[in-house]
């Protein structure tokens, strides 16, 4: 099994290595090389479960397995979001969670997975063969979506086999953007390597050493724009209580959510639909999502300067979640 090192930031090369090559020129080829060699595909999984206690109640779970930073999650039913599907919930890392009937409770379970409970009764309740889709917007991968549904003959309390990596749709902006950068980077890398074939290589200082030669995936962590949050105090004090849907979110409000394209046929719920979100602000930049910030009158968060190399525990797919290493 491959194990890999985590590099919190690019260290300056050792004094003897600078020579005619500048510091920047030294660093760039290795960053690009990492990107070219290891650019992998993230994975989204979706699991739909009918609750044994409430026969018409569903729990949808979704997870993102990639090295990028999640900036938005959209859960929809009746097909992919934006392609005839109706939005059930939108989860933002900092600004909170918005949900629409029949969604009862949406929440983050970890920093890379979410769950959504659906009410079972009423005209808008789902039937057993309804398709549920989860779309994760992340940087640098772009947007990735997968769908799942309960088999018609499912027994209560059983879950449908989770969809294994069937990424139904990846937004072109994300794919083309990243692919373009990688392609350009690879070409430029080859050019640089030709020019500096006989120069010594810089040494990256990993924060956690690896017994094997690392083949890691590069991810440039971005920092969410704190200025846009208008936090009045640095200290936040919260009683340790379970999540409730009537909790007002401390940083963000209806003005931001009002601009979200929900494709929903029904009106958003009232205050009870609000819930604070547990996921942290882990760099919230995705090219396809910039419109959201613009509509909300905010600058898209800027990309931070650091570089983190993340281990890749299972073959070519990098599973590590971003750690905002300085």
């Amino acid at each position: 099994m491959r194990t890999e090192a985590q590099v919190p930031a690019l260290q300056p090369p050792e004094p003897g290595l600078e020579g005619a090559m500048g510091h920047r020129t030294l660093v760039l080829p290795w960053v690009l090389l990492t990107l070219c060699v290891t650019a992998g595909t993230p994975e989204v999984w979706v699991q739909v479960r009918m609750e044994a206690t409430e026969l018409s109640s569903f729990t949808i779970r979704c997870g993102f397995l990639g090295s990028g930073s999640i900036s938005l999650v959209t859960v929809s039913w009746g097909g992919p979001n934006g392609a005839g599907g109706t939005t059930l919930a939108v989860l933002h890392p900092e600004r909170g969670i918005r949900q629409w009937a029949p969604a009862r409770q949406a929440r983050w379970e970890t920093q890379s997975s979410i769950s959504l409970i659906l009410e079972g009764s009423g005209a808008s309740s789902p039937c057993a063969n309804t398709t549920f889709c989860c779309k994760f917007a992340s940087f640098p991968e772009g947007s990735w979506e997968a769908c799942g549904s309960l088999p018609p003959s499912s027994d209560p309390g059983l879950s449908a086999p989770p969809t294994p990596a069937p990424i139904l749709r990846a937004d072109l902006a994300g794919i083309l953007g990243v692919s373009g950068v990688l392609l350009f980077g690879c070409v430029y890398l080859l050019h640089l390597l030709r020019r500096h074939k006989h120069r010594p290589a810089p040494r990256l200082q990993p924060s956690r050493t690896s017994p094997q030669a690392p083949r890691a995936r590069a991810w440039a962590p971005s920092q969410a724009s704190q200025a846009a949050l208008h936090v009045p105090y640095a200290t936040i004090n919260t009683s340790c209580r379970p999540a409730t849907l009537d909790t007002a979110h401390p940083h963000g409000g209806p003005s931001w959510w009002a601009s979200l394209p929900t494709h929903a046929a029904h009106r958003p719920q009232g205050p009870a639909a609000w819930a604070s979100t547990p996921i942290p602000a882990r760099g919230s930049f995705v090219s396809v999502e910039n419109g959201l910030y613009a509509q909300a009158g905010e600058r898209p968060p800027h990309t931070g300067p650091g570089l983190t190399l993340f281990p890749d525990p299972r073959g070519p797919r990098a599973m590590e979640g971003p750690l905002g290493v300085r």
């Epitope: 999984w45 401390p250 979640g321 905002g324």
Partner: antibody
């Protein structure tokens, strides 16, 4: 590298409160959830809850909902946990732990709380 | 809440032999090909140390003699060959849903 430095041991009387700290360094404090875990002497580990330092949101194990208060100071990159109405059952080592994606790779050294009359 | 049941509670293994620790969840904690179960080692007076994440992925810097397997509800930590320094208590943890829970622990002694 990532480091979580916890405050020193606390000796408290029954009914009192204690507030322990976990100072984070080596990463961007607001980027990851900070979890708290309890371990009674000679016993196993119990997950208490976490705080999201970026917006102050907390989630807790139901068992600790009236016992623990989690907070965070972004300016000093420090997470806090206050335990109130202490009883002998609260005597334990309390760890802070940093989450990445879906696991907890980084842990503080622990703070020992002893409740004694 | 999901309950994780670890077995055995204690284990005495000869140096160089294989140690096998089991962790059973009260409901599935897997999706796709990933299981939200992680293994930790704890030595007296120290915090837990992550060994394995996602049931089978070795954490960076952890010796290759540690390995994890399993999916759904049944998970296993293997240590082979066991070394003196492996004397510790081992815990499984799930992060499938809140609240997260730990297994009761398995104390490994080297004979």
């Amino acid at each position: 590298q990532v480091q979580l430095q916890q405050s020193g041991a606390e000796l408290a009387k029954p009914g009192a409160s204690v507030k322990m700290s976990c100072k984070a360094s080596g990463y961007t404090f607001t980027s990851n959830w900070m979890h708290w875990v309890k371990q009674r002497p000679g016993q196993g580990l119990e997950w208490i809850g976490y705080i999201n330092p970026s917006n102050g949101y907390t989630e807790c194990n139901q068992k600790f909902r009236d016992k623990a208060t989690l907070s965070a100071d972004k300016s000093s990159s420090t997470a806090y946990m206050q335990l109130n109405s202490l009883t002998s059952a609260d005597s334990a080592v309390y760890y802070c732990a940093l989450m990445i994606s879906a696991w907890l790779p980084y842990w503080g050294q622990g703070t020992l709380v002893t409740v004694s009359a | 809440d999901i309950v994780l049941t670890q077995s055995p509670a204690s284990l005495a293994i000869s140096l160089g032999q294989r140690a096998t620790i089991s962790c059973r969840a009260s409901q599935s904690v897997s999706a796709s090909s990933y299981s939200y179960v992680h293994w930790y080692q704890q030595k007296p007076g120290q915090p837990p140390k992550l060994l394995i994440k996602y049931a089978s992925s070795l954490e960076s810097g952890v010796p290759a003699r540690f390995s994890g397997s399993g999916s759904g509800t049944d998970f296993t930590l293997n240590i082979h060959p066991v070394e003196e320094e492996d004397t510790a208590t081992y815990y499984c943890l799930h992060t499938w849903e809140i609240p997260y829970t730990f297994g009761g622990g398995t104390k490994l002694e080297i004979k």
